[in-house]
Structures are given as C-alpha cells and as structure tokens.
C-alpha cells in the first residue's frame, strides 16, 4: 500500500519560516500534489500549493517556494512574517494524487523538541 | 473544442472480440490520463478500464480482467478498447472519457458513447 | 472498492423547487467527489468536482457540499433542462465508483 510522508522544519534563521517536505512511497506515477495547512483540503484545510509534474506549480501566500525534490518529492517553504504566518502547533498536510491507484495523504507539524524560541 | 469520438460498437456473438476506438481532438492528448466507462441498459456507470498519460499505468475492475486491455496511440490521439471473450453481460454503451487532474481525478470530457451488443 | 450510496434513487419535483441528492461513500474519500448529470441517450456531463466546485458553464444554481463520507448536490431552484439523472462520483480511490443514480422526474 502506499504511503505519504511529511516532515516539517522551523528555519533557525528566520523566524517562524516553515519548510515542509513531503514525499510518497508507491509504485504509481505522481498526477497531482496538494499541500494545504490547518488540515487535509477536503476537511476545513487551506491550499498552500498544487504541484503538477507537466503544468507546472501553483503557490499561495505565505508559501514562498514549492518545488519538487524527485519525482515523488516536493518541499515547500512558507514566509514567516505577516498576519497568516503559521505558527509553531499549525498542522500541515500532503495530498498525493497517484494515477490510476488514487489519493493519499499524511499530515504533520513541527516536533515538539522544536522551540520558536531557540530558532534565532 | 475538446471533443472525443468513440467508434467500433455492434452485435457480437458471446465469446467474440470487439475493438472499440476513441478520437480525442481539441487538446493535447499524451497529458492527460484516458478511460472507458460502460453503462448497461436502463442502469449505472461502471468504470471498465483506464490508462495512465504515459502509458505505463493501467485498471481493470475483475469484472473484465483478462478479457480487455486498454491502449493508447498518442500519434494518432487515439484510445483503444480491445474486448475479447464477450459475455451478454457486457451489452452496454460504452463511453471513452478524460481525466482532469486539477479537478481530482473528475471526468471532464465524454464521448457520445458507442453500443456494444453481446448476443446469439 | 469504495461504494457510493445515493438518496433517493427517484425524485419528482417542479419547477422552481429547491432539491437535494445525498451520497454517502463506504470510507472517507477526502474532498474527491464529483457529481454527474445525464439525459436519456446522451453522455454523462460533469457538473461539480472536489465537492463543491462548479464545472465551467455549469450554473450557480447547482451546488455541492460535504466532506468525508457525506456529500450533498443541491439543485436551488429547479428549471426545466434540470430534469435528469445525477451520479456521485468518487476518485479518491481506484475504482472510481459512481453512485446508481438519482432520476429526477417533473412532478
């Protein structure tokens, strides 16, 4: 069966800048990459990015740059100033759209081991 | 105008063969994901078969695994449903369809649909 | 396979009415759902897509809610070309299933 991973991490030089990197584990070729915050995009979740391997990326603020690691890997880095910067409980979900098998997803936040306060 | 043009229906004897094509025209062919959903008369929707945009991928419900294989010509734009060992069960309109990624896998474009007709 | 169970199965309505068509998925299907529309001896013609996002063309009076396994298409104020009948779709997962169909007739 496959499966979804996610990592997140707090920058340590900038503050409450986020990267998330998510990745899938299967057989089927990527269609489709949707990473949303605050919970999966079918349930209340905000898009942050789409990523298609042939049409290209589409980003919302605050994400600053998505952009595929392999073939089967994306990360993403969100801006960490302004009104809708995440903070450091935000949940972040990875939705991997493989063809024909179907969607997967995973959903992860920061460690807690990962204190705001010493990533300056 | 996309538009696709299902082709190759007719009156076949159980335990014959048919081969069902489609005429894709209006949009680029090879970058989307293809398939061949079946209606029996006075009844639902069933999905019988769908192929990846590369090629590599395919699915088959065990309804009519072993006995049809789906194929693809991106130099002719065409979809091809070769149906072998034919059963009366198999009697339905048979419609070529296309798969929008950004619209989660949805079918965006049908063909009018040709009849396929098993019976002695 | 994921099976997709639509209410009713036959609806009579007028003109003007305000409907609502009901599919419940087996197991979450996240927000992948699509809802079809079809007239007798033609295709199948897609109105709605992750839930509750109108395909281009398709009317404002059509609409689409829910997530998980409960997912509603709602048909605001009935017009004549709207007689049809309407599939639920999944494609969260391999097989796409559709719903058996809901058969809205004028009353």
């Known amino acids: 069966t496959p499966e979804v991973w996610v990592q997140v991490r707090m920058e340590a030089t900038e503050l409450s800048s986020f990267t998330i990197r998510c990745g899938f584990l299967g057989s089927g070729s990527i269609s489709l990459v949707t990473v949303s915050w605050g919970g999966p995009n079918g349930a209340g979740g905000t898009t942050l990015a789409v990523l298609h391997p042939e049409r290209g990326i589409r980003q919302w603020a605050p994400a600053r740059q998505a952009r595929w690691e392999t073939q089967s890997s994306i990360s993403l880095i969100l801006e960490g100033s302004g009104a809708s910067s995440p903070c450091a409980n935000t949940t972040f979900c990875c939705k991997f759209a493989s063809f024909p098998e179907g969607s997967w997803e995973a959903c992860g936040s920061l460690p807690p081991s990962s204190d705001p306060g010493l990533s300056a | 105008e996309v538009q696709l043009v299902e082709s190759g229906g007719g009156l076949v004897q159980p335990g014959g063969s048919l081969r069902l094509s489609c005429a894709a025209s209006g949009f680029t062919f090879s970058s989307y994901h293809m398939s061949w959903v079946r209606q029996a008369p006075g009844k639902g929707l069933e999905l019988v078969a769908a192929i990846s945009r590369d090629g590599d991928s395919t699915y088959y419900p065990d309804t009519v695994k072993g006995r049809f294989t789906i194929s693809r010509d991106d130099a002719e734009n065409s979809l091809y449903l070769q149906m072998n060992s034919l059963r009366a069960e198999d009697t339905a309109v048979y419609y070529c369809s296309r798969h929008e990624d950004y619209f989660g896998f949805a079918m965006d474009s049908w063909g009018q649909g040709t009849l396929v007709t098993v019976s002695s | 396979d994921i099976q997709m169970t639509q209410s009713p199965s036959s609806l009579s309505a007028s003109v003007g009415d305000r409907v609502t068509i009901t599919c419940k998925a087996s197991?979450?299907?996240?927000?992948?759902v699509a809802w079809y529309q079809q007239k007798p001896g033609k295709a199948p013609k897609l109105l709605i897509y992750?839930?509750?996002n109108r395909f281009t063309g398709v009317p404002s009076r059509f609409s689409g809610s829910g997530s998980g396994t409960d997912f509603t298409l709602t048909i605001s104020s009935l017009q004549p070309e709207d007689f049809a009948t309407y599939f639920c779709?999944?494609?969260?997962?391999?097989?796409?299933?559709f719903g058996q169909g809901t058969k809205l007739e004028i009353k």
């Open positions: 779709q999944q494609a969260y997962r391999s097989p796409w299933t």
């Open positions: 197991q979450s299907v996240s927000n992948d």
């Open positions: 992750y839930v509750s």
